[in-house]
């Protein structure tokens, strides 16, 4: 057992251009507080077990009001250390998240408002009992300077706080088989304290609190013989060869107690003794409450007014995990509709919309046919962020409002003259040509290259183009 300690030295603008604006103002005074979350191990998988080593919240810092026109200085900090007690061995490698929060003290409806100012994270190796380690982390334009260490709580010592020390019983030497405790030479390494009730004859331990059985013995306290000649074992199927009852699997086999809980058998089942901070039949529920502020990144904590009721963090989109400690790649959700390009700027999500679409998420189809009329009998054709009007004969333009000049394209061939007509155009063909657009030459003998002119039409007569 031991304590991880974090000392915040300063929080303020980092070096370089683009100094951040002060988070507080005369109109909106505020104060800072910090939150630390620890997880064992260096691997990314450690993120899946939020704050498994523990978490702590600092006190609130002094109230700060920005001086008008002054650059943001280092902000006043809360007094004291942040302390995260750990019950078991110190893992040696750990991941941390440190968050800087702002508490606004203006006339807020429903009390002060909290908002996350900065969040830093890292992975480190650290031996318990060592000196303070110094660190600088940057989050955007902010810079956080801090120190940290892990120290063991007596009687534990060592780089993992797993060895136990006791004051010497004799001034000159330690007991048989026990070494002096470095660096506390005036103390002796104590024998390991096994799980309470562990059989001294048939059980032993290599870690505090465990009970491992010698061959031939079983049960959580190594008090049950594996096979009894007296055949009085209280459970298990009958053995056909010996006629004795051989113990079957016990309720504590495989240890059903989660989160470091210890299992003990009861007449009917088993009972878990849970470590501090956990509860439930199998120690599966964390005893942290909403009062501890367990939800990161603006997550809303629900339930958990007392240690006997669980809390749930409702995460804002963009964060997930049981404590809202993990940032989601918001663009992976493809929030930009209609082919828009997604940009996750960290502080905000932006969509760059394709032509014809608008809105924060490109949800507004500017060019759809809804409420858009095509004039003069035209019909609206929609598709892919663009709309067009299919115009009735004689009309054109985007909304079919322009009267089309059917002669503008010079449709009459071979020098034919074009006349606009209410239902289209008429070509008056030059001598020697015929057809709707004067496209066919007339042979010298007066016969058309076509099979025949329509009845009533002489070659050279104007023909209407429909």
């Amino acid at each position: 057992a031991g304590v991880f300690e974090l000392q915040i030295h300063s929080f303020g603008p980092g070096p370089g251009p683009g100094a951040p604006r002060s988070p507080c103002s005369a109109r909106l005074p505020c104060r800072l507080f910090f939150r630390v979350c620890l997880k064992p191990g260096l691997s990314e998988e450690a993120a899946e077990s939020p704050c498994a080593l523990g978490a702590a919240l600092s006190a609130r810092g002094p109230v700060y009001t920005e001086q008008p026109g002054a650059p943001a200085p280092d902000l006043p900090l809360p007094d004291g250390l942040l302390q995260v007690p750990f019950r078991d061995a110190w893992p040696g490698t750990f991941s941390f998240i440190i968050e800087t929060w702002r508490e606004e003290l203006g006339d807020q409806i429903g009390g002060p408002a909290w908002s996350l100012l900065a969040r830093v994270a890292g992975r480190r190796r650290l031996a318990a009992g060592g000196p303070w380690a110094r660190d600088i982390q940057r989050a955007g334009a902010w810079e956080l300077r801090f120190s940290y260490r892990a120290r063991c709580e007596p009687p534990a010592v060592g780089t993992a706080c797993t060895r136990l020390c006791r004051p010497r019983s004799a001034p000159s030497r330690c007991g048989p088989g026990l070494r002096p405790c470095a660096p506390l030479e005036d103390e002796c390494e104590a024998p390991l304290v096994c799980r309470a009730g562990c059989s001294p004859e048939h059980g032993f331990c290599e870690q505090p609190g465990e009970c491992r059985c010698l061959e031939g013995w079983t049960g959580p306290l190594c008090t049950v013989p594996v096979s009894t000649s007296s055949c009085l074992s209280p459970r298990g199927p009958s053995s056909a060869t010996t006629g004795c009852l051989v113990p079957g699997p016990g309720p504590c086999d495989g240890n059903p107690c989660a989160n470091g809980g210890s299992c003990s058998e009861t007449p009917r089942s088993f009972e878990c003794t849970c470590p501090r901070g956990f509860y439930g039949l199998r120690c599966e529920v964390s005893g942290v409450t909403c009062a501890d502020g367990p939800c990161f990144n603006g997550g809303l904590c629900v339930g958990g007014a007392d240690p006997d009721s669980a809390y749930i963090c409702h995460c804002p989109p963009g964060f997930q995990g049981s404590n809202c400690e993990k940032r989601v790649d918001r663009c992976s959700l493809q929030p930009c509709r209609n082919g828009g390009l997604c940009l996750d700027l960290g502080h905000a999500l932006r969509c760059r919309c394709r032509a014809g679409f608008a809105g924060p998420r490109c949800e507004h189809d500017l060019d759809d046919c809804a409420g858009r009329a095509c004039a003069n009998g035209g019909t609206c054709v929609e598709g892919g962020g663009a709309h067009r009007c299919s115009c009735a004969l004689g009309f054109g333009g985007r909304d079919c409002r322009e009267r089309a000049d059917p002669c503008a394209a010079r449709p009459c061939a071979h020098g034919g003259r074009c006349y606009a007509h209410f239902s289209g155009l008429v070509c008056a063909c030059a001598p020697g040509y015929m057809g709707a657009r004067c496209e066919f030459p007339v042979h010298p003998d007066g016969a058309s290259a076509l099979p025949a002119a329509p009845p009533g039409l002489r070659p050279g007569d104007p023909q209407r183009y429909l």
Epitope: G110, A113, G298, L300, P316, P317, G318, R330, L333, Q334, P335, R337, N338, A348, L349, G359, P360, R361, E363, H364, D365, D368
Partner: antibody
């Protein structure tokens, strides 16, 4: 706990006006867009209007465009719907509903109990 | 506007039954489909957003699936408190539109 409470409904004659209010609590109001949705007697839900968290983006259904105005006062945690030129077909229960954070999904994740508007001569 | 067609408009089922409600959009809504539950005299509740994501506090017997234009809400084992009217809503393109609703009644 997120809470939305509508008020301001009542009986009004065709062509008349009404102003609905929605009081919000239990969340940071200025972080969320809000919708108005209505439900005519015995009918389904119909989206009416939307205003973004800062009030910069406003949308209306075609059926109310030009007659209804949505607005908000973040300092008072309040949303409003000014309804003018009311018609019989505007008779409905009007709900305010919170949009999702950052409008990624355009959901309506928490709803009020509604206020009844009756347009009749 | 995108039309949302929900079916069936009503169904009768017993406690423990598996219930499936479908919603069809008139064009691709790229999974921006949400499901709501409405009970008389109670506030409307969001159940599922973005086709398949369960809203906080919603029991895991509710699930959603689909893509393109066709979407489904499934209640794996109907409970007494699930008798209500269910609506789908598309959040892809303005105006936001709802399906006509499906009333789930006790058989």
């Amino acid at each position: 706990e997120v809470q939305l409470v509508e008020s301001g409904g009542g009986l009004v004659q065709p062509g008349g006006s009404l102003r609905l209010s929605c009081a919000a609590s239990g969340f940071t109001f200025s972080d969320y867009g809000i919708h108005w949705v209505r439900q005519a007697p015995g009918k389904g839900l119909e989206w009416v209007a939307y205003i973004s968290s800062g009030g910069y983006t406003i949308y209306y259904a075609d059926t109310v465009k030009g007659r209804f105005t949505i607005s908000r006062d973040n300092a008072k945690n309040s949303l409003y719907l000014q309804m003018n030129s009311l018609r019989a077909e505007d008779t409905a229960v009007y709900y305010c509903a919170r949009g999702d954070y950052e409008d990624i999904f355009y959901t309506m994740d928490y709803w009020g109990q509604g206020t009844t508007v009756t347009v009749s001569s | 506007d995108i039309q949302m067609t929900q079916s069936p408009s009503s169904l009768s089922a017993s406690v423990g039954d598996r219930v499936t409600i479908t919603c069809r959009a008139s064009r691709d809504i790229t999974k921006f489909l949400n499901w709501y539950q409405q009970k008389p005299g109670k506030a409307v509740k969001l159940l599922i957003y973005y086709t398949s994501r369960l809203h906080s506090g919603v029991p895991s017997r509710f699930s959603g699936s689909g893509s393109g234009t066709d979407y489904t809400l499934t209640i794996s084992s109907l409970q007494p408190e699930d008798f209500a009217t269910y609506y789908c809503q598309q959040g892809n393109t303005l105006p936001w539109t709802f399906g006509g609703g499906t009333k789930v009644e006790i058989k």
